[in-house]
């Protein structure tokens, strides 16, 4: 139901949901630090623009007694309980930052009259697509799907001369929140990915995956999975792999591949890693000193949520417009704003756009090298290494179906 917003008379409040169940197991203190870093910048920008207003964040914690799984499984009710808490205390701000779990975001969006914007660091699932007042600051599953279809269809690159139409998807149910929803989108029979592929089978058991690696009767040479190299090693070990198998390892929020001293282990030679462009190094910034490389994106999304709110608040105040209106709630999309570590672009539906990077292991140097990049904003692939030193025959990616000739 409608809750009055603390969002007028020169005082603007941000409600930050600090949920026990979260897309990433990040200490809430780190998220608080990220929010406070963002607030300092927003206040400075508003002050320098001659806007004499107050901006604060209210951190809303759940009691943690009922919803204590720590992951997203019991997040649906936790999100609604927090909203009820806000409602009872009449403490809704101008904007809601969090939740990060797809279940809770979907349910909260359904069960509230959203006349305020909702900014999420997560909510990766397709069920959170096309929500008019929801902004997602970490790459959602839809963006991954569009890359995969684009890449599958590509057949005019020196290293990829076949278009693909088949795939196996490995999904065993133990995935992290981001991987769960990425794979869920690929599995869904009504998704764009499924619609565009002629053959797709989900492998749910370790043995199924292991058997496919050398199965002469396999229906596809391509296997998509999600996680880090260690996850792959636990599953694959040092097993022999047919020479025309291609494993696509989706590991978006991990910039360790770009570190100078990293050498790719031997089991990664027939793997293409899909990750996000590392952009810039955050190692020296005050909010990220305590963060592991894989957690940085999550805290950064909270920080960027604050900066996005500040960006919109400044625009509306400078134009003399009211903040507690549907216009404000619907404005957090189709724009580029000054993110903490560089410009951040949101698409027409409020979802972050990014540069995805496909890496391969060089057989010469045993280093990860960039094969191509993909701009989610324009749905376009840009080849980087025209003469990759692949493990695959003739330094070309194989056909997706063994024995099928050029197309």
């Amino acid at each position: 139901s409608q809750v009055s917003q603390n969002c007028h008379n020169g005082s603007y409040e941000i409600s930050v949901l600090m949920m026990g169940n979260s897309a990433f197991a990040e200490p809430l203190k780190n998220l608080e630090d990220a929010v406070n870093e963002g607030l300092e910048i927003v206040r400075g920008r508003l002050q320098n623009a001659g806007l004499n207003v107050t901006v604060n964040a209210t951190f809303m914690y759940s009691d943690g007694l009922i919803h204590n799984s720590g992951d997203c499984r019991s997040s649906t009710c936790e999100g609604l309980d927090l909203l009820r808490k806000i409602s009872n205390a009449q403490r809704m701000g101008c904007v809601l930052i969090g939740p990060s779990c797809t279940y809770s975001t979907f349910q909260m969006y359904l069960d509230t009259e959203l006349s305020y914007p909702m900014i999420s660091a997560g909510s990766f699932g397709l069920s959170c697509d096309y929500k008019e007042t929801l902004t997602r600051l970490m790459s959602p599953a839809r963006k991954l799907m569009y890359f995969l279809v684009n890449f599958w269809k590509t057949n005019d690159l020196p290293f990829k001369t076949y278009s693909w139409s088949t795939s196996y998807v490995y999904k065993n149910g133990t995935e992290t929140e981001d991987c769960f929803w990425y794979l869920n989108a690929l599995e869904a029979s009504v998704s764009y990915f499924s619609h565009e592929l002629g053959f797709k089978v989900v492998l749910r058991q370790d043995k199924e995956f292991q058997d496919i690696l050398m199965d002469h009767n396999r229906k596809s040479n391509v296997i998509i999975m999600c996680g880090g190299p260690e996850f792959l090693y636990k599953l694959k070990g040092d097993r022999a792999v047919a020479e025309d198998i291609v494993i696509i390892l989706v590991d978006l929020f991990n910039d360790q591949y770009f570190e100078d001293n990293v050498t790719a282990p031997d089991y990664m030679k027939n793997v293409l890693v899909l990750t996000l462009s590392p952009g810039n190094s955050l190692l020296n910034s005050s909010f990220s000193r305590n963060l592991s490389p894989t957690k940085r994106d999550f805290a950064l999304a909270y920080l960027n949520g604050i900066l996005l709110f500040g960006h919109m608040l400044k625009i509306f105040l400078e134009n003399g417009e009211n903040i507690t209106t549907p216009k404000f709630a619907h404005a957090f999309r189709n724009l580029t704003f000054e993110g903490y570590d560089g410009p951040v672009t949101l698409d027409d539906w409020g979802d972050v756009d990014s540069t995805m990077v496909l890496l391969y292991t060089s057989v010469d140097t045993k280093k990860y090298k960039v094969l191509l990049t993909y701009d989610t904003h324009v749905n376009k692939t840009y080849p980087v290494d025209m003469s990759p030193t692949f493990t695959w025959k003739n330094s070309k990616l194989p056909n997706d179906i063994t024995g099928r000739g050029p197309q």
Epitope: G44, T336, G339, G342
Partner: antibody, heavy 114, light 107 residues
């Protein structure tokens, strides 16, 4: 309102490093993106690079191998270093605040000549 | 890189005239465009941001319009102090790029 003032040597010898400082008053440098832009005599404007809130940087690819932008929050200053300069680097150099270059300094002319 | 094609490269007009400068982007940039006024020895000044929003303190005779790839800066009634070079800038895509500039002179 934020005010910017560029400073540095007006004459630099070829192959040396050009060093400029942008001193900011009326606001903290931590609250803005910072850019350097240059304008060679009789030509248009060329963006050199950004330094973001986080302190990380992004440079124009044509200059990337020679340019370094840094900041000193204690002095509220942003710096530009351009190495191995040639006569083609002779220009008026400006610093600017914000992704959309909201505020500019008045610029400083740097001549590269022996 | 996105190319910004600005026209005309120069113009001469009388005081009170309506002056229009256009900028065309090589690909769509939404409204991520600003207009800047440069005068020798002075700090450049942003006149318009987000394609059509007037910068605080800038006279209302300046206005901007357009979205996507076609943008216009209009000076509704040219004044002596408007003699300057005007540039457009896109910051939608990396790297930010400027138009070639338009030199405005008073007849």
């Amino acid at each position: 309102q934020v005010q910017l003032q560029e400073s540095g040597p007006g004459l630099v010898k070829p192959s040396e490093t050009l060093s400029l400082t942008c001193t900011v008053s009326g606001g903290s440098i931590r609250h803005y993106y910072w850019s350097w832009i240059r304008q060679p005599p009789g030509k248009g404007l060329e963006w050199i690079g950004y330094i973001y809130y986080s302190g990380s940087t992004n440079y124009n690819l044509s200059l990337k191998s020679r340019v370094t932008i840094s900041r000193d929050t204690s002095k509220n200053q942003v710096s530009l270093k351009l190495s191995s300069v040639t006569a083609a680097d002779t220009a008026v150099y400006y610093c600017a605040a914000g992704m959309g270059f909201d505020y500019w300094g008045q610029g400083t002319l740097v001549t590269v000549s022996s | 890189d996105i190319q910004m094609t600005q026209s005309p490269s120069s113009l001469s007009a009388s005081i009170g005239d309506r002056v229009t400068i256009t900028c065309r982007a090589s690909q769509a940039i939404r409204n991520d465009l600003g207009w800047y006024q440069l005068k020798p020895g002075k700090a450049p000044k942003r006149l318009i941001y987000s394609a059509s929003s007037l910068q605080s303190g800038v006279p209302s005779r300046f206005s901007g319009s357009g979205s996507g790839t076609e943008f216009t800066l209009t000076i509704s009634s040219l004044q002596p102090e408007d003699s300057a070079t005007y540039y457009c800038l896109q910051h939608n895509s990396f790297p930010p790029t400027f138009g070639q500039g338009t030199k405005v002179e008073i007849k």
